[in-house]
Amino acid sequence: ELCDDDPPKITHATFKAVAYKEGTMLNCECKRGFRRIKSGSPYMLCTGNSSHSSWDNQCQCTSSAARNTTKQVTPQPEEQKERKTTEMQSQMQLADQVSLPGHCREPPPWENEATERIYHFVVGQTVYYQCVQGYRALHRGPAESVCKMTHGKTRWTQPQLICTGETEPSQFPGEEEPQASPDGLPESETSRLVTTTDFRIQTEVAATMETFIFTTEYQ
């Protein structure tokens, strides 16, 4: 059952899913100048049986200029760099992720994918919070939120996390090193990084190209 609301917003914190529950949908979004192929599904869907979960459908993007063709356009040098970056992030994410029964891992990138990922979560999904760089976590309990359903209405539990303006960021489960983050999150409506239950994710890589950065914020 789809969650029909958004995970709570915690000031100076971001969240992510470690794995995606079966039923989770990911929008097939393409970068500017590209569009989803005509015959392509608008979503990828996390499906599975008792032993294995995986993403159904493959997102495919084609040039907006190229009508009636599914030919994959060769990326320009700057696009290749962006794609390589995304591939690297994906590998790092996979290394981080636990194999949970009934859950899918982060799907690999596709050619000319948009810079944001929009996920649609389902009941039972857990997301984990961490403070952004420059803020320290004061935990009163688990820094996580779970989508639950009561009387046919969905809601996310409130994460027990407060982020105070001090040095080190907190860590997501299973991560040993603090993650790098951009200095502050952009506040303008146009540039804001987004996550909702239609969970938009924008990923970047640090200048060192060594640390996976995961920055998300509400739309």
Partner: antibody
């Protein structure tokens, strides 16, 4: 009590546009998504899409992606759905319904008739 | 898209009858929801998450099922129950409804 009050019936020419409104009261408007559902004469219900009023994020049924544009105005607690390039087959009753899970509250419906 | 097929499309019954409407989904879904609609009115939530009665709904209504097969039952049809009934899934986008079952007077 929760109420969704929709704008009145409209008669439109083919090729024109129409904007249907849905004014919410009795709850926090930004706490629930607003969905839109279409019902053609004598037909069943079709989900068109929703808007998250607190963020402006919209999700559409692909069938209506090029037909409908859903917006919301927090200041007036009103959701809107604009239908473009109207054709006779767009003649239907359009409902708004409060989300957050099952549709527990519905507007009374707005009949849009497209006729030359 | 998940297709929802209701049967029958029309059901002729009398007051006091036991009425059963089935809804079959083209793929497995987690829950089914049911709405009742009367002519000229908006749909009204009847049953949510397969078997739970919405507020104010009489106990003669019940729902059951799992996977792809779901059922709405009215144990003893009352005059107020003549209406059209729709099943609805919200397990995946696009959200979809059945084509409706009209319960009419025999």
């Amino acid at each position: 009590q929760v109420q969704l009050v929709q704008s009145g019936a409209e008669v439109k020419k083919p090729g024109s546009s129409v904007k249907v409104s849905c004014k919410a009261s009795g709850y926090t408007f930004t706490s629930y998504r607003m969905h839109w559902v279409r019902q053609a004469p004598g037909q069943g219900l079709e989900w068109m899409g929703y808007i998250n009023p607190s963020t402006g994020y919209t999700e559409y049924n692909q069938k209506f992606k090029d037909k409908a544009t859903i917006t919301a105005d927090e200041s007036t607690n009103t959701a809107y759905m604009e239908l473009s390039s109207l054709r006779s087959e767009d003649t239907a009753v359009y409902y708004c319904a409060r989300g957050g899970g099952v549709f527990d509250y519905w507007g009374q419906g707005t009949l849009v008739t497209v006729s030359s | 898209d998940i297709q929802m097929t209701q049967s029958p499309s029309t059901l002729s019954a009398s007051v006091g009858d036991r009425v059963t409407i089935t809804c079959s989904a083209s793929s497995s879904i987690s829950y089914m929801h049911w709405y009742q609609q009367k002519p000229g009115k908006a749909p009204k939530l009847l049953i949510y998450t397969t078997s739970n009665l919405a507020s104010g709904v009489p106990a003669r209504f019940s729902g059951s099922g799992s996977g792809t097969e779901f059922t709405l039952t009215i144990s003893s049809l009352q005059p107020d129950d003549f209406a059209t009934y729709y099943c609805h899934q919200r397990s995946t986008y696009p959200l979809t409804f059945g084509q409706g079952t009209k319960v009419e007077v025999k």
